[in-house]
Amino acid sequence: KKEDGESTAPTARPKVLRCKCHHHCPEDSVNNICSTDGYCFTMIEEDDSGTPVVTSGCLGLEGSDFQCRDTPIPHQRRSIECCTERNECNKDLHPTLPPLKDRDFVDGPIHHK
């Protein structure tokens, strides 16, 4: 028996997790905070000049397992970390750029230490 007021229609999963967002804020975000039913993330990647840029925000539950898996992309240096343990947990994440592969040394001296 259904409880009084309970609907049989499917309901959207509530957005329960709040995350810090930076360079990746939806239009409805307030004070650089977004809400999600999935994960918070922080990502670091290099732009075309070789400058490291950090972005952070919310990932929806759908597909976030794949997005949070830090699969290497050829010729692109990036790293992502995800969390769900508490609100704004991603402000404590600190992804770092992966080390350069030997083949990247052909890009010239600016691309390695």
């Epitope: 000049s49 490291p52 840029v53 402000k91 600190h94 600016i110």
Partner: antibody, heavy 119, light 107 residues
Framework: QIQLVQSGPELKKPGETVKISCKAS????????MNWVKQAPGKGLKWMGW????????AYADDFKGRFAFSLETSASTAYLQINNFKNEDTATYFC????????????WGTGTTVTVSS | SFVMTQTPKFLLVSAGDRVTITCKAS??????VAWYQQKPGQSPKLLIY???NRYTGVPDRFTGSGYGTDFTFTISTVQAEDLAVYFC?????????FGSGTKLEIK
């Protein structure tokens, strides 16, 4: 020894263009990044961006996109900062600063160039 | 952009005193914080990089510590020539941002 020597002070009218030079000596220009940092009178330091001295690709902080341009003359071991359409708020001392590759602290700083707006 | 909140703004100390300056980052910076000294009329000079590494030629009275969001810079025994403004800087992500500075004055 390693030095970054910048061009002398400039007095500019609003709307004019200024080009500041930064000559590197004691090391090879193309093996380190070259950054530009602004210091307004009595104020703190603001990173403007940098130029990848190997590829020549510049990157600008958001506040310095548009009127500002970084360039290189590698044969002369010199980096340049050009400010177009000079404005009152551009009055400042500008520093070039070297960074090790893929490190973003600045281990050698230029002598500084003060650019002032003339009324 | 990431904010580096530096305190205090001013310090008035006597030669021989111990001085501590703090910087609080708005996000986890790991070890990616540097400290600079700028004497009056001069360019900044790098003192500390990666939070705790003393740059070449920097006297050992200058030390840095911290990780994540809280960083500390210490001068163990202040000398007259330490009169300067000190800045922290995060070098983790573009745009690389500086603290507002701490002006150290000697009594």
């Amino acid at each position: 020894q390693i030095q970054l020597v910048q061009s002398g002070p400039e007095l500019k009218k609003p709307g004019e263009t200024v080009k500041i030079s930064c000559k590197a000596s004691g090391y090879t220009l193309t093996t380190y990044g070259m950054n530009w940092v602004k210091q307004a009178p009595g104020k703190g330091l603001k990173w403007m961006g940098w130029i990848n001295t190997y590829s020549g690709v510049p990157a600008y902080a958001d506040d310095f996109k548009g009127r500002f341009a970084f360039s290189l003359e590698t044969s002369a071991s010199t980096a340049y900062l050009q400010i177009n359409n000079f404005k009152n708020e551009d009055t400042a001392t500008y520093f070039c600063a070297r960074s090790e590759l893929r490190n973003w602290y600045f281990d050698v700083w230029g002598t500084g160039t003060t650019v002032t707006v003339s009324s | 952009s990431f904010v580096m909140t530096q305190t205090p703004k001013f310090l008035l100390v006597s030669a021989g005193d111990r001085v501590t300056i703090t910087c609080k980052a708005s996000q986890n910076m790991g070890h990616n914080v540097a400290w600079y000294q700028q004497k009056p009329g001069q360019s900044p000079k790098l003192l500390i990089y990666y939070a705790s590494n003393r740059y070449t030629g920097v006297p050992d009275r200058f030390t840095g510590s911290g990780y994540g969001t809280d960083f500390t810079f210490t001068i163990s025994t202040v000398q007259a020539e330490d009169l300067a403004v000190y800045f922290c800087q995060q070098d983790y992500s573009s745009p690389f941002t500086f603290g507002s500075g701490t002006k150290l004055e000697i009594k």
